[in-house]
C-alpha cells in the first residue's frame, strides 16, 4: 500500500476553497479501505471505502470527502476559514483482506484573511 499526498503547500484566500488530494494505491485488490485525514495531529474523519463508496461524505468543519476510482481521495474545504490553517495528513489502511497501512506527507495549508492588513505580520514571518 502506498499513499501520495498533495500539494505540499497550499495558500488560499479566506472564503475560497481548498482541495487536498490523497492518492492511494495497492498492487492487489482490496475489499475495505480505512482512510483518515488529520489536521495538526487531530482526526478530522475516519471513514472507510467499500464497494466503491465512502461510508461518510463529511470531514471536519466545511470538509467534503470524495473517492474517485481507481485511487483518488479528495478532501475539499469550502468555504475556507482562518481556522483551517494547519498541517494535514492523509492515512490509509487496507482492513480486508490483510492489514496494511501507509500515510502521506504533510500538506501545509495557509489561509489568508479577506483583509490583507490582518496578515501583515504573519506574511513577514514566512521564510524567504
Amino acid at each position: 500500500l502506498s499513499v501520495q499526498q498533495g500539494p505540499n503547500l497550499l495558500q488560499v484566500r479566506q472564503g475560497s476553497q481548498a482541495t487536498l488530494v490523497c492518492q492511494v494505491d495497492q498492487a492487489t485488490a482490496w475489499e475495505r479501505l480505512r482512510v483518515k485525514w488529520t489536521k495538526d495531529g487531530a482526526i478530522l474523519c475516519q471513514p472507510y471505502i467499500t464497494n466503491g463508496s465512502l461510508s461518510l461524505g463529511v470531514c471536519g468543519p466545511q470538509g467534503r470527502l470524495s473517492w474517485q476510482a481507481p485511487s483518488h481521495l479528495t478532501l475539499q474545504l469550502d468555504p475556507v476559514s482562518l481556522n483551517h490553517s494547519g498541517a494535514y495528513v492523509c492515512w490509509a489502511a487496507v482492513e480486508i483482506p490483510e492489514l496494511e497501512e501507509a500515510e502521506g506527507n504533510i500538506t501545509r495549508l495557509f489561509v489568508d484573511p479577506d483583509d490583507p492588513t490582518q496578515n501583515r505580520n504573519r506574511i513577514a514571518s514566512f521564510p524567504g
Epitope: S2, A27, T28, W30, G52, A69, P70, E100
Partner: antibody, heavy 120, light 113 residues
Framework: QVQLQESGPGLVKPSQTLSLTCTVS??????????WSWIRQHPGKGLEWIGY???????YYNPSLKSRVTISVDTSKNQFSLKLSSVTAADTAVYYC????????????WGQGTMVTVSS | DIVMTQSPLSLPVTPGEPASISCRSS????????????LDWYLQKPGQSPQLLIY???NRASGVPDRFSGSGSGTDFTLKISRVEAEDVGVYYC?????????FGDGTKLEIK
C-alpha cells in the same frame, strides 16, 4: 533505468538450501511503493510466483512454498534475496527476479533469469 | 487460489492474419473499489524473460505495438493481435494480481505457419 540481475549457484544438492540474490541497479530498493519478487519457471513449463517483499519489509509468499521460502532485502547493497530450503529435483527451474509497484501493479522489469539444477 | 485457464494452448498463425487468445479466471478479477480488472498479459519470446504487453486487462504497456489489444472484464479476457508478425512468436501468459498468491495461466504458444 531499472535493471535486475540474478546471481547464485547453478547447482544445489537435494535437501540443501537454494540461495539466490537479485542486484538492483538504477533504482533504490527502499523506494516506497515497490515490491521485489521472485518467480520461477520449471523446464518447458509455465511461470510460478514464489513471493515478494515490499518496501516496508512485509513478505508475501505462495502458500505452496511458504514453509520453505524466505525473501529478504539488503538495502545497503541494493539487493534482495531468495532462500528455498529442503530442495528436491522438483525445484529445478529458471529463477527470475522482478519488480512491481503499488501504482503500476505489473511486473515491468525482470532479470534475465538464472537456471538452478537440484541434483546430487 | 485463483486458477487461470488459457486457450488455445497452441496457436499456429499465418503472418498478417489475426490471432486471439482467451483467458478465464476461476473468480472475478474486477474490483468495484478501483474500477479495475487485475489481469495482465505477458509475452515470453524464445530464450528471453517475459515482457509485459497489457496491464489492467486493456491498457497497452509502453513500447508495445498497437496491433496488440486486450479486452474483457470479470472472469473472461481476450488478447488480440490484429496482424501477426514473425517477431510475435513465443508463449503468451495471462496473470492475475487480484490477491496473493499471484497466478499465471499455462501459456499459449504462438507459432508461425
Amino acid at each position: 533505468q531499472v535493471q535486475l540481475q540474478e546471481s547464485g549457484p547453478g547447482l544445489v544438492k537435494p535437501s540443501q538450501t537454494l540461495s539466490l540474490t537479485c542486484t538492483v541497479s538504477g533504482f533504490s530498493i527502499s523506494t516506497s511503493g515497490y515490491y521485489w519478487s521472485w518467480i520461477r519457471q520449471h523446464p518447458g513449463k509455465g511461470l510460478e510466483w514464489i513471493g515478494y517483499i515490499n518496501y516496508g519489509g512485509g513478505t508475501y509468499y505462495n502458500p505452496s512454498l511458504k514453509s520453505r521460502v524466505t525473501i529478504s532485502v539488503d538495502t545497503s547493497k541494493n539487493q534482495f534475496s531468495l532462500k528455498l530450503s529442503s530442495v528436491t529435483a522438483a525445484d529445478t527451474a529458471v529463477y527470475y527476479c522482478a519488480t512491481m509497484a503499488d501504482r503500476f501493479a505489473f511486473f515491468d522489469v525482470w532479470g534475465q533469469g538464472t537456471m538452478v539444477t537440484v541434483s546430487s | 487460489d485463483i486458477v487461470m485457464t488459457q486457450s488455445p494452448l497452441s496457436l499456429p498463425v499465418t503472418p498478417g492474419e489475426p490471432a486471439s487468445i482467451s483467458c478465464r479466471s476461476s473468480q472475478s478479477l474486477f474490483s468495484s473499489n478501483t474500477n479495475r480488472n487485475y489481469l495482465d498479459w505477458y509475452l515470453q519470446k524464445p530464450g528471453q524473460s517475459p515482457q509485459l504487453l497489457i496491464y489492467h486487462a486493456s491498457n497497452r504497456a509502453s513500447g508495445v505495438p498497437d496491433r496488440f489489444s486486450g479486452s474483457g472484464s470479470g472472469t473472461d479476457f481476450t488478447l488480440k493481435i490484429s496482424r501477426v508478425e514473425a517477431e510475435d512468436v513465443g508463449v503468451y501468459y495471462c496473470q492475475h494480481h487480484y490477491e496473493t498468491p499471484l497466478t499465471f495461466g499455462d501459456g499459449t504458444k504462438l507459432e508461425i505457419k
